[in-house]
C-alpha cells in the first residue's frame, strides 16, 4: 500500500465541513520523486489540497471539503501515472442527519394475538442507517417510578411497528413505553406513554345478521330493517358501546351512523330508511365507559328494506265497446301523492256484488295501464287499485254513467311546434269538474286502442297543451269529454296537424300543342294526401336558349298553360313548382322546340 | 370492603324450586358481569350461568339451561338464581362471583349450600 | 362447548418442590385461561387471569404460561400454604368451563 488517507469523520451532518489526508509513503520509489498528490470525491477532482514533504520523506496532502452535500460518495487520494490517474486509497463518506424525535406513538392491545402492538411515525430520513427500539418497563404508578424493564422490541428492518408478546405485558398496570432513535449521528427519544394494556384494548367487532322472521313477529314497517348482531365472545365480558353505520348500496350516498347502542342489545330494527332499498350495514364498538379503540368495523351486511304500498292517485277513463255495451275499456294513470310512492307491482280491477258482504269479485288483474272485460249487468261500479308485496293503494271508484252533462263549445286545436298541438274549448255553464283529452292518429290510422290521453283535474281549464305522441305530418285526431260529480258531458272531436308537409312532388308537364311563339302545356294535379297542406299555387318557369328566364304564377285549381311570345325555331326547358303553405316542390324539366316560320302548327 | 354475600340455599324437595340471592357491596355492581358455580359435594368446580352488566345477555349450562333463571337487579346491588325443577345432581355449594373483563372470577362469595333431597 | 382437561389429577410434593400443572383446551382459545386456587371448605381463589398475568396480592412464585390449547401453572417453589386444589377455566367463550382440578397433597 502506497497511500493511506484519514479523515477528521467518516460520517458528519449533511453539508458539514470534513478533512482528509493522505500520505504516500517513501518506499513507492517507482513512482515519481515529487509524485503531485490529487484529490477525487466521486467522479470529481478536488482542488484545493496543501501537499508537503515529510521530514521521513513521506509526502502529504491534506485537504479540507467544506461542505459535504453528498449522503454517501468516496473520496480518493489519486497520483498521475502516465496518462491514467492511480488511486492510492479511498474511504467512504456518509452524510446525513441525527434521528428527529419518533412522534405520534401509539399502542393498541389485541386480546386474540395477546399483544400489545406499538406503531410511530420516525420522522424525516436521516440518509444513515438509523435503528429503532421500543422500550418499556413495567410500573405501579403513573410511570414516575420505573419498575422491571421489558425486554427491547427490535421491529424488523424498515417497519415502524413492534409487538410486545403477552409475556412481558401486565394487565390493569401501568406501562412506560417510548421509541428510541439512534444511528452514527446521534440518538433521540419519543415522549414516553404511560398506558395500561387493558384501556388501548381493540376488540374484534361483532357478525352482523338479519333476523331469522318468526311467526309470532310481526314483519318489519316500510322503510325498516330488523337486524342482529353476535358479539365477539371473548369481549363480551368487557362493557361496550357500539355504532352502526348504513347507507344504500346504489348512488352516492354517504354513510350514517346510528348510535350509541349498547353491545347487548344484539338485536335492532333501524328505521327511517327508504322502502324497497338494498342497504350495506356494518357496526364496531369500542370498551366504554372504560377507555378503548374502536374495533374495525364488520364485514358488511347486505339487507333490503321492506317496501310500502302504492300512495298513488289512479286517474281513470273508460270506454264501452259500440258492438256491445257491456264490455268496458278501463283506463288509468297512477299520479304520485308523495315523493316516495311506493313501487307498484300491478293493479286490479275488481266488483262487490250488492247483497254479497265481503265477496269481491276481480274483473282484471295486470301489469299494463289498462284492461278490457265484461261489466256484470247489475255492475256500475268497479274499484281500481294498485298492489304491491306491502299492500294496495286506496281504492279507486270508477262509475260508469250515461252522459248526462252538457257539452262543451267551440273545440279547435292548433300547432305549437312539431311536437305538440294545443286544444282550446269554451268550458260549458255549470263548470265540470275536469277534462279527459284523448287523441291518436286521425284517418285513415285511426285505432281506438292506440289513443293517448291525460286527465285535466281543473274544471275552469279552457285548454290543455298535447305534447306526448305528437309527431309532425301526421293528421290527430283530438277528443275532449267533460267530467261531472256523477256523469260526463258528451265528447267533442276535432283533426289537427302539428306540423304539415310540402308537396311530396309537382305533377308532370305534358306538351298540348305547339307553334312558332307558342305552346300549350297541360298536367295532371297530384291527389291531395293526408298530413300534407292543400296548394295555395303553381309557378311554371320557362328559360330560353340564352338563358333568360320567364315565369307565370297560377291558381291552385289550374291544369295547364299557354305560354306566348317565344322565338320561332327556338329551344325552351320549362319546369311547374307546386306550392303550399308548408313548402314547394319543382316538377322534371320538359324541353321544347318553338316550330320554323315555315312550319306548320302542330295541334 | 368488596364482598359477595350469598343467601337463599337451604333443603328442597326434588321437582321444588329455590331462589338465591347474592349481595354485593364495595364495587360499582352495575360495570360487572356476575355469574355463578357450584359445587358439588367432593367435587369439582361447575360454571352455572352468568350475567351481563345490564342483564341482556344470560349463558346457562346445558345441564340447568329452562329449569334455572339467572337475573340482577342493579338499583339493590343484588343477584339472583331463580332454580326450578330440582334434581338430586342439583346438590352443591352455589358460589356468587364477580367476573372481570376477561372472564375471569375475580371475587367470590363464600358460598350457599343448595341440598336436593325427598 | 370446549371442554378443559387438567392434569394431572392429583399430585404429591415437598415444600420447595417446583410443581407444574397442565390444562389442555379442546381448541384454541388465544390467552383466555384463568387459574384458581382452592382450599377445604373456602371458596376459590383467582391466582392467574388471561393465561399469565398474576392477580393482585398472589405471591410471584406463582406463574402461567401458553396459549392456544396448552397451558401451565408453575409454583417455583412449593410453600405450605400452597396445599390446595387448583383449577384452570376457560373464558373465551361466554360458557366458562372448569377443568377437573389438579389435588397438589404432602408428600
Known amino acids: 500500500e502506497c497511500g493511506h488517507i484519514s479523515v477528521s469523520a467518516p460520517i458528519v451532518h449533511l453539508g458539514d465541513p470534513i478533512t482528509a489526508s493522505c500520505i504516500i509513503k517513501q518506499n513507492c520509489s517507482h513512482l515519481d520523486p515529487e509524485p503531485q498528490i490529487l484529490w477525487r470525491l466521486g467522479a470529481e477532482l478536488q482542488p484545493g489540497g496543501r501537499q508537503q514533504r515529510l521530514s521521513d520523506g513521506t509526502q502529504e496532502s491534506i485537504i479540507t471539503l467544506p461542505h459535504l452535500n453528498h449522503t454517501q460518495a468516496f473520496l480518493s487520494c489519486c497520483l498521475n501515472w502516465g496518462n491514467s490517474l492511480q488511486i492510492l486509497d479511498q474511504v467512504e463518506l456518509r452524510a446525513g442527519y441525527p434521528p428527529a424525535i419518533p412522534h405520534n406513538l401509539s399502542c393498541l392491545m389485541n386480546l386474540t394475538t395477546s399483544s400489545l402492538i406499538c406503531q410511530w411515525e420516525p420522522g424525516p430520513e436521516t440518509h444513515l442507517p438509523t435503528s429503532f427500539t421500543l422500550k418499556s418497563f413495567k410500573s405501579r404508578g403513573n410511570c414516575q417510578t420505573q419498575g422491571d424493564s421489558i425486554l427491547d422490541c427490535v421491529p424488523k428492518d424498515g417497519q415502524s411497528h413492534c409487538c410486545i408478546p403477552r409475556k412481558h405485558l401486565l394487565l390493569y398496570q401501568n406501562m412506560g413505553i417510548w421509541v428510541q432513535a439512534e444511528n452514527a449521528l446521534g440518538t433521540s427519544m419519543s415522549p414516553q406513554l404511560c398506558l395500561d394494556p387493558m384501556d388501548v384494548v381493540k376488540l374484534e367487532p361483532p357478525m352482523l345478521r338479519t333476523m331469522d322472521p318468526s311467526p309470532e313477529a310481526a314483519p318489519p314497517q316500510a322503510g325498516c330493517l330488523q337486524l342482529c348482531w353476535e358479539p365477539w365472545q371473548p369481549g363480551l365480558h368487557i362493557n361496550q358501546k357500539c355504532e352502526l353505520r348504513h347507507k344504500p348500496q346504489r348512488g352516492e350516498a354517504s354513510w350514517a351512523l346510528v348510535g350509541p347502542l349498547p353491545l347487548e342489545a344484539l338485536q335492532y330494527e333501524l328505521c327511517g330508511l327508504l322502502p324497497a332499498t338494498a342497504y350495506t350495514l356494518q357496526i364496531r364498538c369500542i370498551r366504554w365507559p372504560l377507555p378503548g379503540h374502536w374495533s374495525d368495523w364488520s364485514p358488511s351486511l347486505e339487507l333490503r328494506t321492506t317496501e310500502r304500498a302504492p300512495t298513488v292517485r289512479l286517474d281513470t277513463w273508460w270506454r264501452q265497446r259500440q258492438l256491445d255495451p257491456r264490455t268496458v275499456q278501463l283506463f288509468w294513470k297512477p299520479v304520485p301523492l308523495e315523493e316516495d310512492s311506493g313501487r307498484i307491482q300491478g293493479y286490479v280491477v275488481s266488483w262487490r256484488p250488492s247483497g254479497q258482504a265481503g265477496a269481491i269479485l276481480p274483473l282484471c288483474n295486470t301489469t299494463e295501464l289498462s284492461c278490457t272485460f265484461h261489466l256484470p249487468s247489475e255492475a256500475q261500479e268497479v274499484a281500481l287499485v294498485a298492489y304491491n308485496s306491502a299492500g294496495t293503494s286506496r281504492p279507486t271508484p270508477v262509475v260508469f254513467s250515461e252522459s248526462r252533462g252538457p257539452a262543451l263549445t267551440r273545440l279547435h286545436a292548433m300547432a305549437r311546434d312539431p311536437h305538440s298541438l294545443w286544444v282550446g274549448w269554451e268550458p260549458p255553464n255549470p263548470w265540470p269538474q275536469g277534462y279527459v283529452i284523448e287523441w291518436g292518429l286521425g284517418p285513415p290510422s285511426a285505432s281506438n286502442s292506440n289513443k293517448t290521453w291525460r286527465m285535466e283535474q281543473n274544471g275552469r281549464a279552457t285548454g290543455f297543451l298535447l305534447k306526448e305522441n305528437i309527431r309532425p305530418f301526421q293528421l290527430y285526431e283530438i277528443i275532449v269529454t267533460p267530467l261531472y260529480q256523477d256523469t260526463m258531458g258528451p265528447s267533442q272531436h276535432v283533426y289537427a296537424y302539428s306540423q304539415e308537409m310540402a308537396p311530396s312532388h309537382a305533377p308532370e308537364l305534358h306538351l298540348k300543342h305547339i307553334g312558332k311563339t307558342w305552346a300549350q302545356l297541360e298536367w295532371v294535379p297530384e291527389p291531395p294526401e293526408l298530413g300534407k297542406s292543400p296548394l295555395t299555387h303553381y309557378t311554371i318557369f320557362w328559360t330560353n336558349a340564352q338563358n333568360q328566364s320567364f315565369s307565370a304564377i297560377l291558381n291552385a285549381s289550374s291544369r295547364g298553360f299557354v305560354l306566348h311570345g317565344l322565338e320561332p325555331a327556338s329551344l325552351y326547358h320549362i319546369h311547374l313548382m307546386a306550392a303550399s303553405q308548408a313548402g314547394a316542390t319543382n316538377s322534371t324539366v320538359l324541353t321544347l322546340m318553338t316550330l320554323t316560320p315555315e312550319g306548320s302548327e302542330l295541334h | 370492603e368488596v364482598q359477595l354475600l350469598e343467601s337463599g340455599g337451604g333443603l328442597v324437595q326434588p321437582g321444588g324450586s329455590l331462589r338465591l340471592s347474592c349481595a354485593a357491596s364495595?364495587?360499582?355492581?352495575?360495570?360487572?358481569?356476575m355469574g355463578w358455580v357450584r359445587q358439588a359435594p367432593g367435587k369439582g368446580l361447575e360454571w352455572v350461568s352468568s350475567?351481563?352488566?345490564?342483564?341482556?345477555?344470560?349463558p346457562y349450562a346445558d345441564s340447568v339451561k329452562g329449569r334455572f333463571t339467572i337475573s340482577r337487579d342493579n338499583s339493590k346491588n343484588t343477584l339472583y338464581l331463580q332454580m326450578n325443577s330440582l334434581r338430586a345432581e342439583d346438590t352443591a355449594v352455589y358460589y356468587c362471583?364477580?367476573?372481570?373483563?376477561?372472564?375471569?372470577?375475580?371475587?367470590w362469595g363464600q358460598g350457599t349450600l343448595v341440598t336436593v333431597s325427598s | 362447548d370446549i371442554q378443559m382437561t387438567q392434569s394431572p389429577s392429583s399430585l404429591s410434593a415437598s415444600v420447595g418442590d417446583r410443581v407444574t400443572i397442565t390444562c389442555r383446551a379442546s381448541?384454541?382459545?388465544?390467552?383466555?385461561l384463568n387459574w384458581y386456587q382452592q382450599k377445604p371448605g373456602k371458596a376459590p381463589k383467582l391466582l392467574i387471569y388471561?393465561?399469565?398475568n398474576l392477580q393482585n396480592g398472589v405471591p410471584s412464585r406463582f406463574s402461567g404460561s401458553g396459549s392456544g390449547t396448552d397451558f401451565t401453572l408453575t409454583i417455583s417453589s412449593l410453600q405450605p400454604e400452597d396445599f390446595a386444589t387448583y383449577y384452570c377455566?376457560?373464558?373465551?367463550?361466554?360458557?366458562?368451563?372448569f377443568g377437573g382440578g389438579t389435588k397438589v397433597e404432602i408428600k
Open positions: 377455566q376457560q373464558s373465551w367463550q361466554i360458557k366458562l368451563k
Open positions: 362471583a364477580k367476573l372481570g373483563e376477561l372472564g375471569q372470577s375475580m371475587l
Open positions: 381448541q384454541g382459545i388465544s390467552s383466555y
Open positions: 388471561y393465561a399469565s
Open positions: 364495595g364495587f360499582t355492581f352495575s360495570l360487572y358481569w
Open positions: 350475567i351481563s352488566s345490564s342483564g341482556g345477555v344470560t
